[in-house]
């Protein structure tokens, strides 16, 4: 903490301006009024203060607002935001999307810091749900944001917000997250026609059940192998050779290159070898003639 010392004669700050960069830390503490600082926070960002000087300015605001800063100050924190701890941020009540954007801008280009994570958490909890505008903003700054949320947190995303999601936003999502997002996407895009619907739903198909994949196989969608490889194993296993052939269309030839990988490998093992042979791809490992084909649903009964 900076010691309390009297402000030297003639040095009392009348406004926040560049002259303050020549003030020593103790002079800033003694000569800058916290209330003046709060009303002129927007000027701080334009002045090249040192980190030590910014520490003093933060200290003055902390003294003025021990219960947490008001949004009028938060919105203009600028680089002073980088000095805030998660504990500081937990005292805030941020409701304006503009405030959120202003602070995210400060951290732009960097990984999500604990401060930013706390800020987002406070903002979203304050709103009660992840609305479209918020999701738009967050994924613009952090494409992986959606996949950083737990399935429980994702459940608060309204289907209308799904329109804001881009394919790259789902790149790091795991199966449990896609299980939550897929039904929302299905609902959001339900009024689109076949080909347009497939374009939109494609990124979410890692959460699709077997019956939806069977339905898609009847629509000439020509799913690419990259999408097929991201499907749930339990959703792929019940598909017949004919259904997979229809689902993939001309991309069915790509199965050969993926035959050692999941879920293709598991699917191959559950098909009759005769059926696999009809694809003409040389896929091996299917069930030989004469063997009983066991359904996955028999798992409980058999074990």
């Amino acid at each position: 903490e900076v010691e309390k010392t009297a402000c030297p004669s003639g040095k009392k700050a009348r406004e926040i301006d560049e002259s303050l960069i020549f003030y020593k830390k103790w002079e800033l503490e003694a000569c800058v009024d916290a209330a003046l600082l709060a009303t002129q926070m927007d000027r701080v960002n334009a002045i090249p203060f040192t980190y030590e000087q910014l520490d003093v300015l933060k200290h003055k605001l902390d003294e003025l607002y021990p219960q947490g800063y008001p949004e009028s100050v938060i919105q203009h924190l600028g680089y002073l935001f980088l000095k805030m701890s998660p504990e500081d941020i937990r005292k805030w009540n941020v409701t304006s999307l503009e405030t959120l954007k202003a602070l995210l801008e400060v951290n732009k280009g960097h990984e999500m810091s604990p401060q930013v994570a706390t800020l987002i958490d406070r903002f979203v909890k304050g709103r009660g749900q992840l609305d479209k505008d918020t999701l738009d903003t967050l994924t613009a700054f952090y494409p992986g944001y959606l996949c950083s949320l737990s399935p429980e947190e994702l459940s608060s995303v309204p289907p209308s917000s799904i329109w804001a999601v881009r394919p790259q936003d789902l790149d790091t999502c795991d199966p449990r997250q896609l299980d939550v997002l897929y039904p929302k996407a299905r609902l959001a895009f339900q009024n689109m026609n076949g080909s347009e619907y497939f374009v939109k739903i494609q990124s979410f198909l890692g959460g699709a059940p077997t019956e939806d994949l069977k339905a898609l196989s009847q629509q000439n969608v020509s799913m690419d192998l990259a999408t097929f490889m991201k499907l749930r194993t339990d959703a792929v296993l019940p598909l017949t050779v004919a259904e997979v052939q229809k689902l993939l269309g001309p991309h069915v030839e790509g199965l050969k290159a993926e035959e050692r990988h999941r879920p293709v490998r598991d699917w191959i093992l559950r098909q009759r070898q005769d059926d696999l042979d009809t694809l003409g791809l040389g896929l091996q490992g299917g069930i030989p003639n004469g063997y009983l084909v066991l359904d996955l649903s028999m798992q409980e009964a058999l074990s």
Epitope: T233, R265, Q299
Partner: antibody
Framework: QVQLQESGPGLVKPSETLSLTCTVS??????????WSWIRQPPGKGLEWIGY???????NYNPSLKSRVTISVDTSKNQFSLKLSSVTAADTAVYYC???????????WGQGTMVTVSS | DIQMTQSPSSLSASVGDRVTITCRAS??????LNWYQQKPGKAPKLLIY???SLQSGVPSRFSGSGSGTDFTLTISSLQPEDFATYYC?????????FGGGTKVEIK
């Protein structure tokens, strides 16, 4: 509940064939939901997957051991077996049999059996 | 074949600590990543499958995350019974591979 139990000789001479059997109780090797694997662990070292078999007889082996390994299944006895030929001291390890649930991982393991290769 | 690299190879921690173990695959394995716990003289035990799903009966202090090539196992508050060796394992490729293991010891 499903249990796995390994059995076989604890000592094998170099150049001979190591033979182990895993008996499944409380479940069936004929289930379409599982792969039946062998995994080994040399003393003080990490885990090495040897291979698996599916009820249909389809097998998949570790490429570094493929030329020496055979895994087979006997559905009538509810067992699956491992044969590893031309063994050397480097094959000394605890050998585990394990069930792999296709939707998860190796969810059930045998308690393991120590096999020493020595003359 | 796909190499699985675990870090650290060992760590010392106290009861109540938050512990994080990472596993990196040499190529993308989607979410086909499992975590196991092994205690001396015992068979490994499945903790987490499909990168983030908790195996039935495993305490909720264990959690997993990641997809593609980078994965994490977290123990939120280390308990005395958690001192063991932890292994990651990929099942994306037909040639299954394990990480080298991370030994969690008492500080």
């Amino acid at each position: 509940q499903v249990q796995l139990q390994e059995s076989g000789p604890g000592l094998v001479k170099p150049s001979e064939t190591l033979s182990l059997t895993c008996t499944v109780s409380g479940g069936s090797v004929s289930s379409g939901s599982y792969y039946w694997s062998w995994i080994r662990q040399p003393p003080g070292k990490g885990l090495e997957w040897i291979g698996y078999i599916y009820y249909s007889g389809s097998t998949n082996y570790n490429p570094s051991l493929k030329s020496r390994v055979t895994i087979s299944v006997d559905t009538s006895k509810n067992q699956f077996s491992l044969k590893l030929s031309s063994v050397t001291a480097a094959d000394t390890a605890v050998y585990y049999c394990a069930r792999e649930d296709v939707l998860s991982g190796f969810d059930i393991w045998g308690q393991g059996t120590m096999v020493t290769v020595s003359s | 074949d796909i190499q699985m690299t675990q870090s650290p190879s060992s760590l010392s921690a106290s009861v109540g600590d938050r512990v994080t173990i990472t596993c990196r695959a040499s190529q993308s394995i989607s979410s086909y990543l499992n975590w196991y716990q092994q205690k001396p003289g015992k068979a490994p035990k499945l903790l987490i499958y499909a990168a983030s799903s908790l195996q039935s009966g495993v305490p909720s202090r264990f959690s997993g995350s990641g997809s593609g090539t980078d994965f994490t196992l977290t123990i939120s508050s280390l308990q005395p019974e958690d001192f063991a060796t932890y292994y990651c394992q990929q099942s994306y490729d037909a040639f299954y591979t394990f990480g080298g293991g991370t030994k969690v010891e008492i500080k």
